[in-house]
């Protein structure tokens, strides 16, 4: 007879897996809120700021009640990759005014990266279809002025904040259905 079979592969508990993803998302949400408040204190902004290169808010993609886990995770991963790219761009090209948001902006980037890895892991553990590799995104043009960089920062942090709220709501709602 051949060698004894190895220990059975423990299938992950999807609720526990989702839980740790929600925890990271909530933690990043709190960081983003704090950084957005810091930005508002230093550079008050009137009204909503938009940046055409940012993803459309996921919440407009449909009511939360109709969401399915693969759709939420795929959409969230795509949106967060875009936000990661924008945060990197902001740190590189945002100008001297935004240097006052370091090291917090660097910490945010690292935590965003960690959440993206966590999502990737969750998708593979739950045997969800892996999204195709992302096509190379066109480079982001540098802000036209110092104020342009500040407006971009308001748009990026505001959009990320709302996206993370959508993610927490969606993931916790899906958890109740598992």
């Amino acid at each position: 007879p051949g060698p004894p079979p190895g220990p059975p592969r423990v299938s992950p508990d999807p609720r526990a897996e989702l839980d740790s993803t929600v925890l990271l998302t909530r933690s990043l949400l709190a960081d983003t809120r704090q950084l957005a408040a810091q930005l508002r204190d230093k550079f008050p902004a009137d009204g909503d700021h938009n940046l055409d290169s940012l993803p459309t808010l996921a919440m407009s993609a449909g009511a939360l009640g109709a969401l399915q886990l693969p759709g939420v995770l795929t959409r969230l991963r795509a949106d967060l990759l875009s936000y990661l790219r924008h945060v990197q761009w902001l740190r590189r090209a945002g100008g001297s005014s935004l240097k006052t948001l370091e090291p917090e902006l660097g910490t945010l980037q690292a935590r965003l990266d960690r959440l993206l890895r966590r999502l990737q892991l969750l998708m593979s553990r739950l045997a969800l279809p892996q999204p195709p590799p992302d096509p190379p995104a066109p480079p982001l043009a540098p802000p036209s002025s110092a104020w342009g960089g500040i407006r971009a920062a308001h748009a990026i942090l505001g959009g990320l904040h709302l996206t993370l709220d959508w993610a927490v709501r969606g993931l916790l709602l899906l958890k109740t259905r598992l």
Epitope: S27, S60, D165, V168
Partner: antibody, heavy 119, light 111 residues
Framework: EVQLVQSGAEVKKPGASVKISCKAS????????MDWVKQAPGQRLEWIGD????????IYNQKFTGRATLTVDKSASTAYMELSSLRSEDTAVYYC????????????WGQGTTVTVSS | DIVLTQSPASLALSPGERATLSCRAS??????????IHWYQQKPGQAPRLLIY???NLESGVPARFSGSGSGTDFTLTISSLEEEDFATYYC?????????FGQGTKLEIK
């Protein structure tokens, strides 16, 4: 001053519907979720659901799914809760409350709207 | 759903005394340094008022005599020295999962 002002008391017959409004002022309406909480006499507070004013639809406590409908009018900074197929157990004070994104704690509350269901 | 049980149901104390209110959850509401428990005060005919969020953070404008502690399933709201205006009903609430739920309340009365 941050404020949530709710519509007045309502008396309804069983089977009817009620729609309560909650007008927000003193803060950016879209920066927070709007939650709704029920307080029936002698019962514990009950979370009904919440809505993000940016859109994407509300989420509900399963107990209220199908009977509660949460909506917002962003331009008027006003949230609404409609409760249909009313029964006597729906007699309660209903509160709107400002909810911290992603954390569900409520730092500003409306004054409450009393709904009485009686034939 | 997570069930929160508060004790005692009522408590009679005098101004100046220390009040300790307890809230126990049917399962852990803490994860990696976060405890998703919040405390509210409610007076008759009024809406609840947030006192403490995420177990131990004092809400802006709330007097420093209020403090929150605990983790896992057991949480405490402490009022270090009672003032006349503190006599009210206190509720704990969790937001660990959906739906958020509330405890049944502890009524703090003047002795």
């Amino acid at each position: 001053e941050v404020q949530l002002v709710q519509s007045g008391a309502e008396v309804k017959k069983p089977g009817a519907s009620v729609k309560i409004s909650c007008k927000a002022s003193g803060y950016t309406f879209t920066d927070y979720n709007m939650d709704w909480v029920k307080q029936a006499p002698g019962q514990r507070l009950e979370w009904i659901g919440d809505i993000n004013p940016h859109g994407g639809g509300p989420i509900y406590n399963q107990k209220f799914t199908g009977r509660a409908t949460l909506t917002v009018d962003k331009s008027a900074s006003t949230a609404y809760m409609e409760l249909s197929s009313l029964r006597s157990e729906d007699t309660a004070v209903y509160y709107c409350a400002r909810g911290e994104l992603g954390h569900w704690y409520f730092d500003v509350w409306g004054q409450g709207t009393t709904v009485t269901v009686s034939s | 759903d997570i069930v929160l049980t508060q004790s005692p149901a009522s408590l009679a104390l005098s101004p100046g005394e220390r009040a300790t209110l307890s809230c126990r959850a049917s399962k852990s509401v803490s994860t990696s340094g976060y405890s998703y428990i919040h405390w509210y005060q409610q007076k008759p005919g009024q809406a609840p008022r947030l006192l403490i969020y995420l177990a131990s953070n004092l809400e802006s404008g709330v007097p420093a005599r209020f403090s929150g502690s605990g983790s896992g399933t057991d949480f405490t709201l402490t009022i270090s020295s009672l003032e006349e205006e503190d006599f009210a009903t206190y509720y704990c609430q969790h937001s660990r999962d959906l739906p958020p739920t509330f405890g049944q309340g502890t009524k703090l009365e003047i002795k």
